[in-house]
Amino acid sequence: SGTTNTVAAYNLTWKSTNFKTILEWEPKPVNQVYTVQISTKSGDWKSKCFYTTDTECDLTDEIVKDVKQTYLARVFSYPAGNVESTGSAGEPLFTNARKFLPYRDTKLGQPTIQSFEQVGTKVNVTVEDERTLVRRNNTFLSLRDVFGKDLIYTLYYWKSSSSGKKTAKTNTNEFLIDVDKGENYCFSVQAVIPSRTVNRKSTDSPVECMGQEKGEFRE
């Protein structure tokens, strides 16, 4: 079955971070083009990246419609030209991607420390609430809006003068920690979804240290 001289796509891979979702595959096309279809388990197939010569397809627009749905996708291979001139043996070749559940499978992007403020022996560290491409009522939702209390942040902090790290956790985007007066501290945060079995943690944020721009200090 399949059309002559076409090769089925292989190595179909979902690449998804903070719901920005791209399906990638191989091989680079030679005398063929690809079309991707996506659907929910109960829905109709919708064609995307029609007759493309790329080996990736941005499916973000479709999966953000409902990030808690399960999505199916497949990649069709068509000969590069009409079938009458290239020869046909019925339906085109296609390859199924593995099921994709955005809420479960999207990776957490690297977080950013928005600010920190010291008041006496307390420091308030705020994590930037990153915007996603998920929409509700025509506005983009933040990561916290989407994941709610499923999302926590872990703060790693240490004295600039030593390497011993301490940790704190929060299910908001703010930490309030105790520090030693007169000491400078460095901070890094990590996003975590504890209920997940895979893709539980983001990479660590860039390190921010007291005595640099992002901080405010009040006695």
């Epitope: 029609f50 068509y78 009409n82 079938v83 019925g90 085109p92």
Partner: antibody, heavy 119, light 113 residues
Amino acid sequence: QVQLVESGGGVVQPGRSLRLSCAASGFTFRSYGMHWVRQAPGKGLEWVAVITYDGINKYYADSVEGRFTISRDNSKNTLYLQMNSLRAEDTAVYYCARDGVYYGVYDYWGQGTLVTVSS
Amino acid sequence: DIVMTQSPDSLAVSLGERATINCKSSQSVLFSSNNKNYLAWYQQKPGQPPKLLIYWASTRESGVPDRFSGSGSGTDFTLTISSLQAEDVAVYYCQQFHSYPLTFGGGTKVEIK
């Protein structure tokens, strides 16, 4: 010789539906991708929709997505365009066209059928 | 979406003279793997459907007179009628078939001066 003959056009009120047909002859219909292209009176050409030779994949212009549905019946050598929720701006001559040497290159066109959306 | 911009909007040329129509795409329609430009030219006479003249930017469709030629690459393309004939009075459209949605230029009307 290759022939594409559209039918089903006419005057329709906004919000109503219409189904266009395109009867194909003179070639192996099931081997070719097919398109609908429209032309508003005195204006340029606008691509509307495409369907692959097998009928599995369909793609639409943003302006008609969710309102129009392209389909084909390879046993009847016929292409269709179901147009729902019609608007005044859908008023145009609708052409069916065949993929030629490559996808999206139209080597044969029908004569067109006029759709007028007016109250 | 790739935007196709044609110039001029209209053109009046004497019989036997050269007519040149330009078409610019908002992004390249050249596919590097096969070095082909995914651009076509059509001619449309009043009351008729368009007729394919040229594809791959410079390949003449079978039966099209050799006074019609296409050139250009990447984002800038030209259709040339080397010696205008009376039957060439029409509107000419460029179209990219590089990526969907397919898009046409706004058209150039060619008339006899």
